[in-house]
Interface confidence: low
C-alpha cells in the first residue's frame, strides 16, 4: 500500500492464533523522515488505541495494553499471551511529519485450545 510517499507492506493480513500465544503483527514501511506509527484495535465492542510512537523513541502504550505489547522500529508490534478477546482488527497508520499517511489492517483470530485438539 502506498500513499503520498508513505508505503506500507503487510506480509500477513490474517493471523490465526490460539490463547496464550505471543503474536507478531508484522509490517514494513518506508517514507521520508521519521514517521509517527499508530496501532488501533477494533472489534464489535468498539475501537481503542493500542500504541503510538516515533521509531527511535519510547512508545506511548495505552493503559489497556500496558505490559502486553512491545514495539519494533519497523512498525511491527508483538502481543503477549493473547486471549480470545484480542480477536479483531488491528489497524496501523504510518504518518509522515507533514501529515501524509497510509493505513493497513491485520485481522487476528484467537481461538481456545480444544481438548480434542491435544490428541
Amino acid at each position: 500500500l502506498q500513499s503520498q510517499g508513505v508505503s506500507l507492506y503487510i506480509p500477513q493480513a490474517t493471523i490465526n492464533a490460539t490463547v496464550k500465544e505471543d503474536i507478531l503483527l508484522s509490517v514494513e514501511y518506508s517514507c521520508h523522515g521519521v514517521p509517527t506509527i499508530e496501532w488501533t484495535y477494533s472489534s464489535n465492542w468498539g475501537t481503542q488505541k493500542i500504541v503510538e510512537w516515533k521509531p527511535g523513541t519510547q512508545a506511548n502504550i495505552s493503559q489497556s495494553h500496558k505490559d502486553r505489547v512491545c514495539t519494533f522500529d519497523n512498525g511491527s508490534i508483538q502481543l503477549f499471551s493473547v486471549g480470545v478477546r484480542d480477536s479483531g482488527y488491528y489497524v496501523i497508520t504510518v504518518t509522515e511529519r507533514l501529515g501524509s499517511s497510509q493505513f493497513g489492517t491485520i485481522v487476528l483470530h484467537v481461538s481456545e485450545i480444544l481438548y480434542e485438539d491435544l490428541h
Epitope: 488505541k49 501529515g99 493505513f103
Partner: antibody, heavy 121, light 111 residues
Amino acid sequence: EVQLVESGGGLVQPGRSLRLSCAASGFTFSSYAMHWVRQAPGKGLEWVAVISYDGSNKYYADSVKGRFTISRDNSKNTLYLQMNSLRAEDTAVYYCAKDQYSVGATTYDYWGQGTLVTVSS
Amino acid sequence: QPVLTQSSSASASLGASVKLTCSLSSGHSSYAIAWHQQQPEKGPRYLMKLNSDGSHSKGDGIPDRFSGSSSGAERYLTISSLQSEDEADYYCQTWGSGIQVFGGGTKLTVL
C-alpha cells in the same frame, strides 16, 4: 455515542472577529486530531484547519492562513476556531470533524451538524 | 497537490445500483481517499476510507449496500439496492502534506 456540537456562529461584519467552539463527547478527545471544514451556501466542502491530538501540530488552508487559529482544550473536550479579519467569502456553515487518528491529518470519521457564520455589513 | 474530480450529478432508480467515480489527478494515482455522504440540510457523514488497491474500511453503521473499489487513478463508490434516503451529495476527499482536498461532489438523485 460520538457527538460533536458546534456553537458560536452568527452574523458578523467584515473585518470583525468570531470564535467558534466544538464540544466533543463519546470518545477520548485527547487522543485524536480534529478538523474544521466549511461549506459556503450552495457550494461544496472546503477544509479549513487541523490540529493534532496534543495541539503540537496545526495546519491551515491557504485561504485562511494568518487570519484563523485552531486550538483545543483537552481538559474541556473542546475544539476552537478563532476567526479574525473576516471577509464576505468566509460566509459558510462551519463543521467540526474528528480525525480517525491522533497525529496525521487523514480523514474524518465523525462530523458535527455545523454552525452558520454570516459575514455581511 | 492532488486534485479530485467528480461528476456533478448522477441518477438511478429505486432498488437499482449506482457507481460514483472520483478521479485523482496525474501523479497521484496511489493516493488513498475517503467518501462522505451529505443528505439534504444535514451535516456530512463518513462512509469509508479507500486504498489504491481497493481495500477499504467503512464507518460505524454504514450498510453493506455501500462498497468501494479502485482502478488506477479512479476511486469508486457503489451503492446497491438504492433507497430514497441515499439521495444526497457524495464527496470524495484525500489528504497530503498538511493539506486536505475535497472533490466537488456528486449530487445523486434516486428516481
